[in-house]
Structures are given as C-alpha cells and as structure tokens.
C-alpha cells in the first residue's frame, strides 16, 4: 500500500467521538500525551484533530489484479508534530512526536460507515482497527465477515472547519 503523493489531498479539522458520543481527548502528562475516551462536561470544548487525507494504491492494483484500486488513508494529529500511531505489538494506539515523512504506523485506511461515521484500519496491520477498550483507544482485530459493524470501532467526525494546507 504505497502513498501516491507526499502531500495530503485534503485536510480537515474535526472533533472525534465514539459511536456512543463519548469524546476522544488528549492530555499532556509527564511530557507525553495520553489519550482518553470520556463523557465531556457540558461546557468543556471538544479537542480538535487535524485529519490529513492521502491517496494510496490498493495492494491488489499494485499486483495487477485491481482496476483502479485507490484507497484513502488518514493521519490524525491533535497537536503540532504529534500523530496517532498504531503500536501493533502492544495492540495500542499512542501519540508520538514525529517528523515528516511520517512512519507507516501513523497511517490508517479510512472506512466510511455513513457521512460522519468512520473506522480507521491500521496500514501496517490490515484487519486491525482503532477501537475503544476500557475507556482507552486500542487496536482491535475485526473479522471482515462481520461487516465491520461492531460499534467499538465506529467513530463520529464533527468537522469544525476546512484546513488550508500548502
């Protein structure tokens, strides 16, 4: 799955919440960021995430089987220079400071469920999705025959505004 361009094709700023309307929040603790899944107090502002969208060739089209075979991959950055990354060994999702070009662990294949409902599949471990486990984000293996319908891997995007990138 190779990214076809070094620049994102589009970007947007959005808040991220679970299917059950819990907010995904990010807190700086001991010089590293922690990710929480929590009910937000009424007046508390939702944390924003910059989603950068990249086009990628689907593996089947690289091998000549696919017709056009493009996929959309996203990176998620809640604050400057930090990106959500898959730790496939620990089955965890972590925030790491990175420089571009970003590592493969920072890319997730975008799956639309409806207009604002999405899932994020790990680029480095197909079939494994960002999900919610014990009020934290984790990597969850999903059986494709289940139609990826499990609510714990569904997230809602509430767009705040479009982000102009250069």
């Amino acid at each position: 799955m190779s990214i076809t361009g070094i620049s994102p094709i589009t970007e947007s700023l959005a808040s991220l919440s679970t299917y059950n309307d819990q907010s995904i929040t990010f807190a700086l603790e001991d010089e590293s960021y922690e990710i929480y899944v929590e009910d937000l107090k009424k007046d508390k502002k939702k944390d924003k995430v910059l989603l950068s969208y990249y086009e990628s060739q689907h593996p089947s089209s690289e091998s000549g089987d696919g017709v056009d075979g493009k996929m959309l991959m996203v990176t998620l950055s809640p604050t400057k220079d930090f990106w959500l990354q898959a730790n496939n060994k620990e089955h965890s999702v972590e925030l790491h400071k990175s420089e571009k070009p970003l590592p493969d662990q920072a890319f997730f294949v975008l799956h639309n469920r409806s207009f604002n409902s999405v899932s994020f599949e790990s680029k480095t471990d197909p079939g494994v999705f960002i999900g919610v486990k014990d009020n934290h984000l984790a990597l969850i293996k999903v059986d494709y025959s289940e139609n990826l319908g499990s609510e714990n891997i569904l997230f809602k995007l509430s767009e705040i505004h479009h982000h102009h990138h250069h």
Epitope: S12, F115, H162
Partner: antibody, heavy 122, light 107 residues
Amino acid sequence: QVNLLQSGATLVKPGASMKMSCKASGYSFTDYWVSWVKQSHGKSLEWIGEIYPNSGANNFNKEFKDKATLTVDKSTSTAYMELTRLTSEDSAVYYCTRGPYYYSSQIIFAYWGQGTLVTVSS
Amino acid sequence: IIVMTQSPKSMSISVGDRVTMNCKASQNVGNNIAWYRQKPGQSPELLIYYASNRYTGVPDRFTGGGYGTDFTLTINSVQAEDAAFYYCQRIYNSPPTFGGGTKVEIK
C-alpha cells in the same frame, strides 16, 4: 474495466412505483459505495443517495428520503433504486455512479452508468 | 445546504482558445470540489477532484484551482470534443450539491 450497466427506459403512470437496476462489473462490488444521481431534462444534477453494498448502510439527500429506496443484491453485483408515488416531477434520467476509493465515499463520482430515462405520464 | 453558483452560463469559443469558468460556493468548502464534463447525449465524466487533482486519464489541458469559496476550471487549447456542459460539485460532505452548469460551444 469498471462498467455500470443500467436498465432500460421506462414509461410509468402517475402514482405508480418503479424499480431500476445497475449491474456492476470489473471491480469488487462490495467494497465501493454506489450513488444515484438525478438529471431532469435540460437541468443540472441532483444527488439522491448512496449505499454501501458490503453492509447495506445508506445515506440520503433529505429531498429524496421518502421518494427513493436503495438496495443491493451482492450475489449478482447489482444495485437497485425504487421510486415511489411518481409524479411528472420525477421524469428524468437517473444515473448510478461509483467513487474512486475502496471503502470510502467522499461523494465523488468517478464512474457513471449510461442512465435510465424515466417518463411519468398518463 | 451549500449552494454552488457557476458563471458564465454559456460561452462560445474557438478550437485552440483558452477558457476559464468559475464556481462559487455559498460557504467555505475548503478544496472539496469536483468538476465534470457532460458531452451531448452522454453521462457526465469526472475531470478534477479536490479542486486541483486531475482524475486518471484526463488530459493535462484541464486545470482546476481555487480554495474556500471561489474555484476555476481552465481548459488550455480547447478541442472540438470539449463542447459540453461543465458542472462543479461540492464533495466530501452531505449533501453533495452541483452548480447549474456552464455550456461551452465551439464556434
């Protein structure tokens, strides 16, 4: 290559319903969202709604929520749109379309069927 | 609903000319715009997506530009086959809306 083959032109009476088909070939049908677009004679385009064949999930333009029903038959790689309570306002060419991306809609229409002309007249 | 307004409504040009048409969104849509060409009696075809990305197989005489609310489609060295209606469309968010179209006639 990708091909979306739509059913033929139909003449229907006001108040009736009709169902048109869109047979997909040349790609993995279940992995791409299918949209439907309306074009009235000499007019612009209107998006009706979309369906994800893998799960049957769908999204609609509010204007068409009570007018159109979208379904798929995975075994034949065919998408269907049924229009109900037809009036002269529904006379148009209807296109099925498909986006450029696996799994993700983005509501971009990269491939189009040849269109189905629906004429509502008594 | 975001309204897409295209101008001019029609234009008549000669083969080899350069032509620019406009599309204005009623709100900021970022770069979430696509352009389509619809030749007489045919289905529309995708030319440009995300404002400036040429779709696979589209000739490089087609160029898209703009961001926010104002967008352009430029055809360098117009060919006879470019006689068509051109539509802009807001993509990415629901509901996607189309402009009223610009008709390009070849003299």
